[in-house]
């Protein structure tokens, strides 16, 4: 088996505090998924990350950091159009049981006002495995830069699995990608949240197989309406 890069897949530790909106969804003490803080009460993640109860880690790039905030959450709202068969509309809002305390290390993500075009450089982050198929989970938040790929080019790889609210990102001939455990985490482009990690080819990091993300710019109305409805 070809050796993989030793971060996210082929990434590096994020600059400390550079992703203050990044959260981890834990099941007990174990990483389940990534997510992003939308405001003091709400986290946005992938619908396929649904559990009955969550522990949300905020405010530190290091899992297990005692200075981090840990907040329980027991209510979550999947997009009503989410399908376990087609993976379309793979997003979900998680309502925190108590408010997050905003600080230099805990900030709200900027939701997009527009969809960024193919070719845009973006950063994906998470605590997901840094090796594949065998797993190695880091304690520090990892980042990798990828570029948005046009739906036409991505369809050449994934054919009819690709739906129009999915977004692809990667680097040609590179292993740079997200992997298991990064699900629900952010793809940030020019300071706004453009994607949530959804799926990709396994083992991770196969050159020319882009990562697939939920295209957040298509769902801002649903996000805002859902938070308002369940205030």
């Amino acid at each position: 088996e070809e050796a993989q890069g030793d971060k996210i897949i082929d990434g590096a530790p994020c600059a400390r505090g550079s992703h203050p909106w990044q959260v981890a969804l834990l099941s007990g003490n174990q990483l389940h998924c990534g997510g992003v803080l939308v405001n003091e009460r709400w986290v946005l993640t992938a619908a396929h990350c649904k559990m009955n109860e969550y522990t949300v880690h905020l405010g530190s790039d290091t899992l297990g950091d005692r200075r981090a905030q840990r907040i329980k959450a027991s209510k979550s709202f999947r997009h009503p159009g989410y399908s376990t068969q087609t993976h379309v509309n793979d997003l979900m809002l998680v309502k925190l049981n108590s408010q997050a305390r905003l600080s230099s290390m805990v900030k709200k993500v900027r939701l997009p006002s527009r969809c960024e075009p193919p070719g845009t450089t973006c950063t994906v982050s998470g605590w997901g495995t840094t090796t594949s198929p065998d797993v190695t989970f880091p304690s520090d938040l990892m980042c990798v830069d990828v570029k948005l790929i046009s739906p036409q080019d991505c369809t050449k790889v994934y054919k009819d699995l690709l739906e129009n609210s999915m977004l692809c990102a990667g680097i040609p001939d590179s292993k740079k990608n997200a992997c298991n455990g990064d699900s629900g985490g952010p793809l940030v482009c020019r300071g706004t949240l453009q994607g949530l990690v959804s799926w990709g080819t396994f083992p991770c990091g196969q050159p020319n197989d882009p990562g697939v993300y939920t295209q957040v710019c298509k769902f801002t109305k649903w996000i805002n309406d859902t938070m308002k409805k369940h205030r």
């Epitope: 174990q30 389940h32 992938a46 619908a47 396929h48 559990m51 376990t84 068969q85 993976h87 793979d90 594949s132 198929p133 065998d134 797993v135 054919k159 699995l161 992997c179 298991n180 455990g181 699900s183 990690v197 959804s198 799926w199 990709g200 080819t201 396994f202 991770c204 697939v212």
Partner: antibody
């Protein structure tokens, strides 16, 4: 290396519930995005997929058996289990557990998988 | 459900023969096909996945080909250890996974 071992009663009475457990050793059942799978083979016949589970607890069942099947996972014991209710003689088979290797991870990890590691199988006879 | 039809159901051959087994899907499954070998009283063993990828540790005399609806498993030079039953499995639809009826390769 990874090994799977089925266990459970070899004889079940008609109308009762068949219960089997698969113990995974040499690796963690929590290693997403693998699928943990049950397959059966009636005497002298071919293979039939029963269903599968992810470590998160998401389950996928054969529609022909869905109303009678429950698959569950216990990550703390590194085990997953099969329950098949209201059994008849037609459920007499060798039952195998296996690991399913997916083509995709994340939202698509329950989808498009083949089995690379199998248990030895356990024979279950349904008879009064 | 996608039906998988294997042919022949039984095949008589000698050591050293080139053996070909065919599997047809009732609808296109792209390259999502696996081949397994099963010996009496034993669990199936993975030989080929994604139609043509050889599983680690499987002898190179085994090869797979095909895409869409028609697939073949070829054993280039049959060895004594290869007398067994072979199954194809489609994993190209979300549910259920389905297997072919099996091909028994027996000594001529």
């Amino acid at each position: 290396q990874l090994q799977l071992q089925e266990s459970g009663p070899g004889l079940v009475k008609p109308s009762e519930t068949l219960s089997l457990t698969c113990t995974v050793s040499g690796g963690s059942i929590s290693s997403s995005p693998y699928n943990w799978v049950w397959i059966r083979q009636p005497p002298g016949k071919g293979l039939e997929w029963i269903g599968s589970i992810l470590h998160s607890g998401s389950t996928y069942y054969n529609p022909s058996l869905k109303s009678r099947v429950t698959i569950s996972v216990d990550t703390s014991k590194n085990q997953f289990s099969l329950k098949l209710s209201s059994v008849t003689a037609a459920d007499t088979a060798v039952y195998y557990c296996a690991r399913g290797v997916p083509t995709y991870w994340g939202a698509a990890s329950h989808y498009y998988y083949y089995m690379d590691v199998w248990g030895k199988g356990t024979t279950v006879t349904v008879s009064s | 459900d996608i039906q998988m039809t294997q042919s022949p159901s039984t095949l008589s051959a000698s050591v050293g023969d080139r053996v070909t087994i065919t599997c047809r899907a009732s609808q296109s499954i792209s390259s999502w096909l696996a081949w397994y070998q099963q010996k009496p009283g034993k669990a199936p063993k993975l030989l080929i996945y994604k139609a043509s990828s050889l599983e680690s540790g499987v002898p190179s005399r085994f090869s797979g080909s095909g895409s869409g609806t028609e697939f073949t498993l070829t054993i280039s030079s049959l060895q004594p250890d290869d007398f067994a039953t072979y199954y194809c499995e489609q994993y190209g639809s979300e549910s259920p996974l389905t297997f072919g009826g099996g091909t028994k390769v027996e000594i001529k």
